[in-house]
Each structure stands twice: as C-alpha cells, then as structure tokens.
Amino acid sequence: LSCHFPRRPAYGDVTVTSLHPGGSARFHCATGYQLKGARHLTCLNATQPFWDSKEPVCIAACGGVIRNATTGRIVSPGFPGNYSNNLTCHWLLEAPEGQRLHLHFEKVSLAEDDDRLIIRNGDNVEAPPVYDSYEVEYLPIEGLLSSGKHFFVELSTDSSGAAAGMALRYEAFQQGHCYEPFVKYGNFSSSTPTYPVGTTVEFSCDPGYTLEQGSIIIECVDPHDPQWNETEPACRAVCSGEITDSAGVVLSPNWPEPYGRGQDCIWGVHVEEDKRIMLDIRVLRIGPGDVLTFYDGDDLTARVLGQYSGPRSHFKLFTSMADVTIQFQSDPGTSVLGYQQGFVIHFFEVPRNDTCPELPEIPNGWKSPSQPELVHGTVVTYQCYPGYQVVGSSVLMCQWDLTWSEDLPSCQRVTSCHDPGDVEHSRRLISSPKFPVGATVQYICDQGFVLMGSSILTCHDRQAGSPKWSDRAPKCLLEQLKPCHGLSAPENGARSPEKQLHPAGATIHFSCAPGYVLKGQASIKCVPGHPSHWSDPPPICRAASLDGFYNSRSLDVAKAPAASSTLDAAH
C-alpha cells in the first residue's frame, strides 16, 4: 500500500523520494511563481496511506520585493492565463550591491482599455518611468537598463476586459560587464559565464523555431559602457519550411501564441531515402474552419495521410515514403485567440521493411488490421461480438520501434443494465442489485399517485448495444380525483362556499340564522376516494326554544334530508 503520486503543480514540479509511508514529496515553482501551501509532504502510515498535507499550488503573486535579484522572472497573476480586474501590483527589484539590472520583455499583453504597465528607474512609485504602456506602442526589443540597482514595476488593471498580462525577465550584471542575454523559445552558449567585454554569445532555437531578426552571434563591446554589439535574435515558429533533419518538430505559426487568420503554410520533411517518417501529433487544437493536411510524399499531389479540422487528442501517423508534406490553412474569416491554440508535431526517422509481431485472435471477438503486413504504422482494431465489451485498448498500433502501442485487450461479456433510477413518489422492488440481464425493477406509486408507463422494467441483451431496459422508467402522477357534489344549506341556515362541486380535500362550513342553533358538524370535508365523499352528514338548524321550533316547522318534523342522497359523490 502506498500514497498516490502527488499532483504536479501547474508552473512547478515535484520530486518524490518514495510513495511508501515515510517517503516525502518536495515541491518547487518555476521562476516568477510562488509556492502556496506546504513545500514538503510526508506519506503517513494508515490502512490507506496518505500525504500529511494537501498538494501546494504555484501562483503568480500580485507584486512583491525581490532583493538580491540576480536572474529571474516576474509574471502577472494568472499568467499565462488572463489576469483579473481591479489589480494594482507593485514589484520592487533590487540587484546585489554594485550591480545594475536589465529587463527583457518576454510578453506584454494588456486589454485595450485602462490597463497599464509602468516600469520605473528607481525604488518607488515616484521614480521616473523608463517604460509606460500608455506612451509606447511597441515593446523595446533590446529591453530596459536601470541606472542604479532598482527597478520598480507597476501593473494596474481596471474593472473591464482582461488579457494574458506580462512576463518580464530580469538579469543583474556587474560594472564592466554586459547583461545576460535571453532568447524566448531558444538557448545560447557563451564564451564566458559573467559576460565581460569580449564575450561572444551564440544563439540557437528550440526545435520547431527559426532564428529571426538580430544576429546569431553577438559580442559584448565597449569597455567604457559595455553593451552587446547587436540586438538579440528572436525565435519564432514560422509558416512553412524545408526540414532535412532525422528528427524535429513542426509548430503552428507563432506557437504557443495563436496563429494568424488566412494563412497557407507548407512544410516539407525529408529523411534518408530508405527510411520512413513517424509523425507524433502531440497537440492539435485548431478551429473548425482550419485544415491541417499530411501528404505521404514530397508535394501536394501525394496521397493524403490524414486531414484534420478542430481539436483532436494525441495520435501518430506513419509515412510510406521518405518525405512528408504538411499543409496548414487557417480560416480567413475567424481568428483564434487562445494561448496554445495550434499544433505541435514531432517527427522521427524510422527504419522501413520491418514488422511488429503477429497478434493473436481474442475469445469472443475479432481483429481487423489496417493492412496485411504489420509494418510500423499498421493499426489493428479489436472488436467484440454483440453483448461483449472491449477491456483495454481496442486499437493497437505498430510503433516505430516495432512494438505494439498497447497490451492485448480482451472481450468481457456486458451482462448488466445501468441503474434505471428512482421515480418520484414511488418505491421500487429490485430482483437483483447489479441489474444483470433478466433483472426486473418494479415501480409502485405512493398512495394518491397513479402510474404512467410500464410498472415493470426488464433488462435485456441487445445485438449491437449493451443491455438495455425494456422500457423507460415510468412516472407517478398525482391522482386526479372526482369532486364531491354540493350539499344544500340547512333550513334556516347557510353554507359557505355555495358551489355545486367541491374538489377532493375541500371543506364547507355551515351556520344558522339568529334564533337557531346548529345540530351536527359545523364544517365537513370532501374526503378523497373512489368516489370522493363527505366526511359527515350535513347539520340541521334547530330553533333555540321549542315553541319557536314548533311554530316555524308547523310540526313538520319528519322531513330531515335522506343521508344517503347527500353523502355520495356519484349522485
């Protein structure tokens, strides 16, 4: 028994010594993010071992003081997602004694309203600004230099609109030295680690990116005021290209920023003539009007390997040639706004003319290979006979290393229906708790409710689908009961309300004229039933004195109403 593997924080990482009791997990955050929660978790012993605390998260703080700032990054809250409204964040950067600071603009994206980024050459809000997003339309590609050891960064957002915000990279540097260069989506090598005058730096881009603007090699010059002789280059994912490497990456234009609309890009990937190409499409998030097409050859007339629109999860393609042509056409009408919208394709040169081992048949199912020879790229699909379901992966692919992508699946009988659920105002009788084929569920409505639909459902096998109930669950509807017929008011009395029909559950009230008293129930109720009926016979009004009674009734005492005629709702 062990603890579960702790969740890696977004914009951070975790290292685990052991998942068994006594083991520990240590968390740390990427530059610009701060850990919220415990830095260190311990796996505690129990019947089910557990971590002694919740996994922490990495958050971009709204402001802070960074003393002894050597190299690092500050990012707006939520980055690379959008910041929130009504923020006022202040960061104070302070370089070690005797050093100055350089700032690189990694990304600045503010909403086009009253959101603002100001960078001040000093240590407080009054210091003179060296960058103000209100004043400057374009970011200075060479970045910013402090005159002293401080930079003061202010980010303020209003109550409307939001964007990705900002990521700034800072580097402290000594007098007589140049600042540490930076290239987004790339790397560099330096002739000396502290960048004194005379240092040369050579830049390269991450796979899939191309060096643009600036120079590949720059040099730290001018002993009086050390500076780089050229602007640092930029690495961009470009639209189109010819690639002859044995492995590499093709990225959507501008990745991970959104690609532009109305683009038509073509990449050619070429490997050695006797080799083939495995395409590993790791990210595919394009719009429904955008098209990514793979051609099995070196131009657009070759056989289409696959054509895709919209999002799709990780998949692989294999060519039958030594060339592949990738075409991406983005919809001119709609623009994609999201970060990391686009595609990431890794490609590898793979050997040809080899096959994966033969796969066996499986009980209660069959297999269908995509082609007779089990060469890399062949897909074998396993299916089960009706009433059976695939356990494991139904699709196995012969990989470039000539192993199958998944273990062999099996076919297990689907033997039960899902729980049909409770029905309001009813109870149910279940023949078997897990609803196997043949199980029945009987619904019995509560008193006062009538059943609409089938009272008994039976679980049946099906030919193509898994087992299903013979009918949908019924409903229990409130019973519509017949009303009681109105009773006449007693002689020398009155009734309320004076209606002909009274709904089940209704009550009528009786009263007598002055000088008369009520004999019987003053209120009687219409009792629901089949048929509905009055709860009591109607009362009579009797004179308060016997003389008055005889005078008023003229000795007509035998005329009390027949009980049966007034109690039955059917009359």
Epitope: G438, D461, R462
Partner: antibody, heavy 116, light 112 residues
Framework: QVQLQQSGAELVRPGASVTLSCKAS????????MHWVRQTPVHGLEWIGG????????VYNQKFKGKVTLTEDKSSSTAYMEFRSLTSEDSAVYYC?????????WGTGTTVTVSS | DIVMSQSPSSQAVSVGEKVTMTCKSS????????????LAWYQQKPGQSPKLLIY???TRESGVPDRFTGSGSGADFTLTISSVQAEDLAVYYC????????FGSGTKLEIK
C-alpha cells in the same frame, strides 16, 4: 412524431458502391439501435446489420460482412450504410429500421437497382 | 443461424372470418433469464414499409387493433386475427431477435 427519412432511389453499375442515408427525427437518436433490412422477391426480408449510435458498436449478418459498412453521425441523427461491389443480386428495397429487440419504426425504403 | 418457417404461404378469407397463421423457429426463442420470447410479428401492406404488430410474442404494439393476437412460446408461435377486415390485406412476417435477426418468408392474406 418518430420518423426515419431515407435517401432517394439509386441506379448503379455492377461493381460500384452506394451509400444510403437514413435521417431520424422525433426521438433521441442514441437511445435505440439502427438496423438495415433489405427486401427482394426471391429472399424476402433479409437483415443486413445494425449499429448502436451511442457506442458506434456494429453487428453484421455474416452474409454481408466485408461488403457493408454501417456508420452514423450523431450531430445530424443520421445513419449510413455503404454497400460495396454491387451485383444484380443486390437490387432490392433497403429499409432502415429502429429497434433493439423488435423493429417498431421503419424507414420509407430506398430502391437500389444494379444494372449495366 | 435461426431459421423461421411460416405457414401457410398464402390464405384467402372473407371479411369477418377468423384467421390463424403459424411461425416455427429452428430453436427456442425463449430467453430463460428475461423469461421473454424474442419473436415479433410485422404487417406489410402493398406498396408500404413493414409495420410492427406484436412483440415479445404476445404484446400488442400501441395503436394495433385488439383483433390481432399473438400467442405461443419456445419455437411455435401463432398470429390470430379474430375478425378479418378489408384493410388487413397484407403479408404478415414473423421475425426473431434471439440471436441476431431473421425473418420468416411471410404469409399473404387475401380477401375473398
């Protein structure tokens, strides 16, 4: 009300393929299997195969395996049957029909004539 | 495959008469777990698509007149029309769903 609307009549050459469609309306498409049945004077009613739109699982009459592919499109509540390598023996009225254990709704039928 | 045999292949009766047709399967259609017979009866009038009359061997589909009655269990089934009407002129098919689906060859009902 529940309806199954089938595509129009087809006249095809021997060896060709044909794809018939069946658009369902008036019920939740994924709640029932969709089957295909054909009718000829010689063989009467013959069950071809069925698809469960919820899982895309298909089942076929052994006689038509490899000759027929059943598919569906949940977004348009439409079932499709692709029939390949047609011969004159395949001239028939083709019905789509809804049902799990019995066929309670039948399509209008599509007449397929295979002739050179 | 389960084979379904229907008899007679055709039958002519007068309006108001009672008619009985039979359907035999090559194996039992009674599912011991669900206790149902997986047999249905269909009516096909000239120029029309088939229509479901009876399922589970004896349950009448809603809207079907009560002169139509299904009976039987296991491998022997009967469809009875208690008093034939002119609009009952049709071919009647039985069909099983115990193992995949197969239909009988039909009984043609003609009105004298």
């Amino acid at each position: 009300q529940v309806q199954l609307q089938q595509s129009g009549a087809e006249l095809v050459r021997p060896g060709a393929s044909v794809t018939l469609s069946c658009k369902a309306s008036g019920y939740t498409f994924t709640d029932y299997e969709m089957h295909w049945v054909r009718q000829t004077p010689v063989h009467g009613l013959e069950w071809i195969g069925g698809i469960d739109p919820e899982s895309d699982n298909t089942v076929y009459n052994q006689k038509f395996k490899g000759k027929v592919t059943l598919t569906e499109d949940k977004s348009s509540s439409t079932a499709y049957m692709e029939f390949r390598s047609l011969t004159s023996e395949d001239s028939a009225v083709y019905y789509c029909t809804r049902g799990d254990w019995y066929f309670d709704v039948w399509g209008t039928g599509t007449t397929v004539t295979v002739s050179s | 495959d389960i084979v379904m045999s229907q008899s007679p292949s055709s039958q002519a009766v007068s309006v108001g008469e009672k008619v009985t047709m039979t359907c035999k399967s090559s194996q039992s259609l009674l599912n011991s777990r669900t206790r149902e017979n997986y047999l249905a009866w269909y009516q096909q009038k000239p120029g029309q698509s088939p229509k479901l009359l009876i399922y589970w061997a004896s349950t009448r589909e809603s809207g079907v007149p009560d002169r139509f009655t299904g009976s039987g269990s296991g491998a022997d089934f009967t469809l009875t029309i208690s008093s034939v009407q002119a609009e009952d002129l049709a071919v009647y098919y039985c069909g099983q769903s115990y193992n995949l689906f197969t239909f009988g060859s039909g009984t043609k009902l003609e009105i004298k």
